[in-house]
């Protein structure tokens, strides 16, 4: 097993991305700067800017996107642009989404197979259990915060007037009508896909057909495959397959090395895509603002609901999660967050946890010193099951709808909302048309009207972005916490808990490639700090 890269006082690996996506060395000062530390001399300022260039570009892109969107909206918006020009306007953003989605499948499958194969079953179980516990607790906390805020701020009472303007007949017809049981059965079915290839682009969903049985019209559930990647099924398969590969012992090592190499190549692609991200984000944000009609009117009517959601996300993301991280690691959580600003901005721009996954992996590994076998095992699981933002929004929405329709919420109903929101947000990845359908499930569980889901949909474009940011932040902090847990358990036991599979050279004698051409080779600083020792990179994900 190779030695770990040296870490600075902040516990950060002294490594920086290179052009080919490999890792080069960085001075401790550079790392301090990169992590948001103090930049003193002009030289340090230059290094600081260089280290944070992508982060700064991303932040600028979001701000520029908002400004550009508002500017175009002010000049007439989507109507003035027309469908063709609007399509061209959002194209750079669409391109980023396509690039990221292209990467998801190989990244998730390979990283999870590699990650699961690189951990001994005991460690895998412990790591998985701690991760799921963290995800569950934080989601429950987010739900509680959502309910608490909505009860305190009463967004529904404030927005009651929109009832009149929307019309009495609401739009319950548009609200998905699906049995709660069928939703969870679909979730189970998607965990075990019948066809792995189709799981890459389709998932199972139950719909209903009305049939005439002995003179009575009966609603019969009919299963069908619908468009949309079954990420839950792929995640479960990849983990189980990785464990199976490990069981094979030496026989499976070649295949493990294949998946690890595949993963590294994918990460090289990610490092290239990262530099396009700011451009894409800018146009994604701008495009969404331009597409929206009557943003002002929407804010006037649903302002308190939006405020409630965004405030909840801000409190959970900037106070609750960082506090949990600090309590367990005694490290500065905001330094950690600074390291993942690019994926957070990407999450805001793309509104997709899985699309943000490639960038998040790259950043937590390179900026926050999370080991590959942790990040590449935990992050895909987190992107699938950890949905703090979604749970919080659904709780706010449920209480908002209760207030809007003047329906009471007793203690039992509040607990039901909390539990259902937590459970359904975990399962949302396995349910096609996740967000709205899971909200409908919550409303059904407490007998609240689904008529007003249309109102929630009206501002979903904004709230969902905030949700995604919180979701991916939770995943990243979870990975950071687990890294801390692993560091502590490893320092306590002489025998390392995480057995790692080395990516050895091919069995046939082949010329050793140069570092530039081989992202599997990495240089670490020697003890003296200047001598460079070539070593084989941990091939674990």
């Amino acid at each position: 097993m190779v030695a770990d890269p040296p870490r600075d006082s902040k516990g950060l690996a002294a490594a920086e991305p290179t052009a080919n996506g490999g890792l080069a060395l960085a001075s401790i000062e550079d790392q301090g700067a990169a992590a948001g530390g103090y930049c003193g001399s002009r030289d340090q300022v230059r290094r600081c800017l260089r280290a944070n260039l992508l982060v700064l570009l991303t932040v600028v892109a979001v701000v520029a996107g908002v400004a550009l969107g508002l500017g175009v909206s002010g000049a007439g918006g989507a109507l003035a642009l027309g469908p063709e020009r609007l399509s061209a306007f959002v194209f750079p953003g669409e391109l980023l989404l396509r690039l990221l989605r292209m990467i998801i499948l190989p990244l998730v499958v390979c990283s999870l197979i590699g990650g699961a194969a690189s951990l001994d079953p005991g460690a895998l179980g412990r790591l998985g259990a701690w991760a799921l516990l963290f995800f569950l607790v934080t989601t429950l906390l987010a739900s509680a915060l959502g309910v608490g805020l909505a009860l305190a701020l009463q967004p529904g009472a404030a927005s009651a007037a929109i009832n009149a303007s929307v019309g009495a007949a609401g739009s319950a017809e548009n609200a998905p009508s699906k049995e709660v049981l069928d939703s969870f059965l679909d979730l189970a079915r998607n965990i075990f896909p019948s066809n792995l290839v189709s799981a890459a682009f389709r998932s199972y969903s139950t719909t209903y057909e009305e049939r005439n049985i002995t003179g009575t019209r009966v609603k019969v559930p009919v299963g069908q495959e619908v468009e949309g990647m079954n990420i839950l099924g792929l995640v479960v398969f990849a983990i189980v397959f990785g464990v199976a590969l490990r069981k094979l012992g030496p026989e499976g090592e070649l295949l493990i090395r294949f998946f690890n190499s595949f993963n590294e190549a994918t990460m090289v692609l990610v490092s290239w895509i990262m530099w396009y991200a700011p451009v894409g984000i800018m146009f994604l944000v701008a495009g969404k603002i331009v597409e929206m009609e009557d943003v002002g009117l929407l804010f006037a009517r649903l302002g308190k609901y939006i405020l409630c959601c965004l405030l909840g996300h801000a409190i959970h993301g900037l106070l609750v999660l960082p506090l949990i991280y600090f309590l367990f690691t005694r490290k500065n959580p905001y330094r950690f967050l600074w390291g993942i600003v690019t994926p957070l901005a990407t999450a805001f721009g793309t509104s997709s946890s899985s699309a943000t996954l490639p960038l998040m992996m790259k950043c937590v590994e390179e900026k926050n010193g999370v080991a590959k076998h942790i990040s590449r095992f935990i992050l895909p699981i987190g992107a699938t099951v950890n949905m703090d933002g979604a749970a919080l929004f659904q709780c706010v929405a449920a209480v908002f709808i209760a207030q809007l329709s003047q329906q009471s919420l007793d203690f039992v109903k509040i607990i039901t909302i909390l539990v259902t929101a937590t459970a359904s947000s975990v399962g949302a990845a396995g349910i096609p048309a996740g967000g709205v359908l899971t909200l409908a499930i919550i409303l059904e569980a407490v007998n609240l009207p689904v008529d007003h889901i249309s109102l929630i949909l009206a501002v979903d474009w904004l709230v969902d972005r905030s949700c995604t940011v919180l979701n991916v932040e939770g995943d990243a902090l979870g990975a950071g916490l687990l890294q801390n847990y692993v560091d502590r358990t490893e320092s306590r036991s002489t025998e390392p808990e995480l057995i790692q599979v080395k990516s050895e050279l091919p069995l046939d004698p082949l010329p050793v490639p140069t570092e530039e051409g081989n992202p599997l080779l990495k240089h670490y600083r020697g003890p003296a700090g200047d001598a460079t020792v070539a070593s084989e990179k941990e091939s674990v994900m």
């Epitope: 009472a157 404030a158 009651a160 007037a161 009832n163 009149a164 009495a168 007949a169 609401g170 319950a172 017809e173 009508s177 209903y208 609603k219 809007l404 329709s405 003047q406 329906q407 009471s408 059904e444 007998n447 609240l448 009207p449 689904v450 008529d451």
Partner: antibody, heavy 120, light 107 residues
């Protein structure tokens, strides 16, 4: 006990305005929405809309937008239905009904009804 | 809007009989079906909500059942005071809609 007491019968000429009151007692007025239901003689019941008693916001059914107005006097625990420019087809019995705060849309307590007759 | 149909507009029964009044919705109303009683020139009373839940103060001889689009109200032991018109109402989505009513008479 919970009671909804409506004002007496009304006889109006077309074009006039009528205001029907519904006084609630026995519960916290602002906790439950108040609905209005119309019954034309020999016909079924038709939901007119409801008023959010906490926010004071009226919500009207599609057939009752324009001439109809719901209002409240919270301090007196009273809801009002006003019909402007009454027409012959407004001849009916109007009920106020407390909207339950559970199980979506149903009405657990009803007023005795106010008969409106529109005749020239 | 969801249409509610009570196929039987009037029904004759003897005291002590078991009477069933049916109601059909134009689409699945997921058990959000309520029953009301209106006595001649009297007030309207809620009998049953959410398909089968008895409202407070309603005698236990009244019961409700059904699912999807088909629902029914049953009076197990008809009494003189039960002579009235019975309305069903869906509370699944706005606007709430009522059936045309079933008038119950004594044979």
């Amino acid at each position: 006990q919970i009671q909804l007491v409506q004002s007496g019968p009304e006889l109006k000429k077309p074009g006039e305005t009528v205001k029907i009151s519904c006084k609630a007692s026995g519960y916290t007025f602002t906790t439950f929405g108040m609905s209005w239901v119309k019954q034309v003689p020999g016909k079924g019941l038709k939901w007119m809309g409801w008023i959010h008693t906490y926010a004071g916001v009226p919500i009207y059914g599609d057939d009752f937008k324009g001439r109809f107005a719901f209002s409240l006097e919270t301090s007196a625990s009273t809801a009002y239905l006003q019909i402007n420019n009454v027409k012959n087809e407004d001849t009916a019995t109007y009920f106020c009904a407390r909207r339950s705060d559970n199980y979506r849309y149903f009405f657990d307590y009803w007023g005795q009804g106010t008969t409106l007759t529109v005749s020239s | 809007d969801i249409q509610m149909t009570q196929t039987t507009s009037s029904l004759s029964a003897s005291l002590g009989d078991r009477v069933t009044i049916s109601c059909r919705a134009s689409q699945d109303i997921r058990n959000y079906l309520n029953w009301y009683q209106r006595k001649p020139h009297g007030t309207v009373k809620l009998l049953i909500y959410y398909t089968s839940r008895l409202h407070s103060g309603v005698p236990s001889r009244f019961s409700g059942s059904g699912s999807g689009t088909d629902y029914s109200l049953t009076i197990s032991n008809l009494e003189q005071e039960d002579i009235a018109t019975y309305f069903c109402q869906q509370g699944h989505t706005l606007p709430p809609t009522f059936g045309g009513g079933t008038k119950l008479e004594i044979k």
